[in-house]
């Protein structure tokens, strides 16, 4: 386990953005259900531009933007760039 | 344990090519969101952050030096170099490798180097 | 380029004052903003992130805050093994931007 400066927080994100993300940007979705000692969902984006962020899992768009992406990676074979899981 | 060890030249002469090299360990820039980078500070003065290399070779350079420096990676090797062409006096600093990962909280530059102190003197 | 306006540049202040550093963002950069120390001949440390998270190891005199576009960096109550150099960073957008430092010196 590699020592981190930051501190283990039971949640990992200490603040959300409501703004949209455009699809054409984000590189992975990852969706954390409560869970772990964090009691509240949990999004993270990772976008193309080697950035980081959490995102308001409440957010309209964000809602829209994973129907879109969810019902592409049924219909298609290749890796779906969400992924849901819990915290390690 | 993560450490980052820098070498290059002590000295060189303006119009010269500094190549630095940054030696790793305690982790790897095979896996997704591993990034390692170059910030440097001329003795006495501020940071600046000059250029990223990711796991997926993407880069990112600072725009005030982006025609003069390069940056590249040796990942079976755990190294990272970085060149700067036509060196003058103002280049003199001491060079820090640092490492960044795209986790949550994501706090780049979260391990840094000794440093390397670099002259350029005619 | 975000530009970040730190200060002051220097600072001497005695054991057990209250120290505040600040830094200023030319554009909203959203507490992407971390803060180093730098002790003399040593290379710097994350001492907090997102604006007001305290790193690991931190003491707790340590503190971050935010206003608008304004981020400041306090010590509640200054210990000597608290000199150094301090620095923001932001990382909203590339290329980062760093403070011009902030050196604390012993009043």
């Known amino acids: 386990i590699l020592e981190a400066h930051y501190t283990n927080l039971k949640c990992r994100c200490s603040g959300v953005i409501s703004t949209v993300v455009g699809l054409n940007i984000i590189d992975r979705i990852q969706v954390t259900p409560p869970g772990n000692g964090c009691p509240k969902t949990e999004v993270v984006i990772w976008t193309k531009m080697k950035k980081v962020i959490c995102v308001n899992p409440r957010a309209k768009w964000l809602q829209r933007l994973l129907r879109h992406v969810q019902s592409k990676s049924l219909s298609s074979t290749p890796q779906a760039p969400v992924s849901k899981r819990r915290a390690a | 344990q993560v450490t980052l060890k820098e070498s290059g030249p002590e000295i060189l002469q303006p119009s010269q090519t500094l190549t630095l090299t940054c030696t790793f360990s305690?982790?790897?820039?095979?896996?997704?969101?591993?990034?390692v980078g170059w910030i440097r500070q001329p003795s006495g003065k501020g940071l600046e952050w000059l250029a990223n290399i990711w796991w997926d070779d993407d880069k990112y350079y600072n725009p005030s030096l982006i025609n003069r420096l390069t940056i590249s990676k040796d990942t079976s090797n755990n190294q990272a170099f970085l060149k700067i062409t036509n060196v003058d006096t103002t280049d003199s600093a001491t060079y820090y490798c640092v490492r960044s990962e795209l986790v949550m909280p994501y706090v780049p530059f979260d391990y840094w180097g000794q440093g390397v102190m670099v002259t350029v003197s005619s | 380029d975000i530009q970040m306006t730190q200060s002051p540049s220097s600072m001497s202040a005695s054991l057990g004052d209250r120290v505040t550093i600040t830094c200023q963002a030319s554009?909203?950069?959203?507490?992407?903003l971390i803060w180093f120390q730098q002790k003399p001949g040593k290379s710097p440390r994350p001492l907090i992130y997102y604006a007001t998270n305290l790193a690991n190891g931190v003491p707790s005199r340590f503190s971050g805050r935010r206003s608008e576009s304004n981020y400041a960096l306090t010590i509640s109550s200054l210990e000597s093994e608290d000199m150094a150099d301090y620095h923001c960073?932001?990382?909203?957008?590339?290329?980062?931007?760093f403070g011009a430092g902030t050196k604390l010196e012993l009043k």
């Open positions: 960073l932001q990382f909203k957008q590339y290329p980062y931007t």
């Open positions: 305690g982790f790897s820039l095979s896996p997704y969101g591993m990034g």
């Open positions: 554009q909203d950069i959203e507490n992407d």
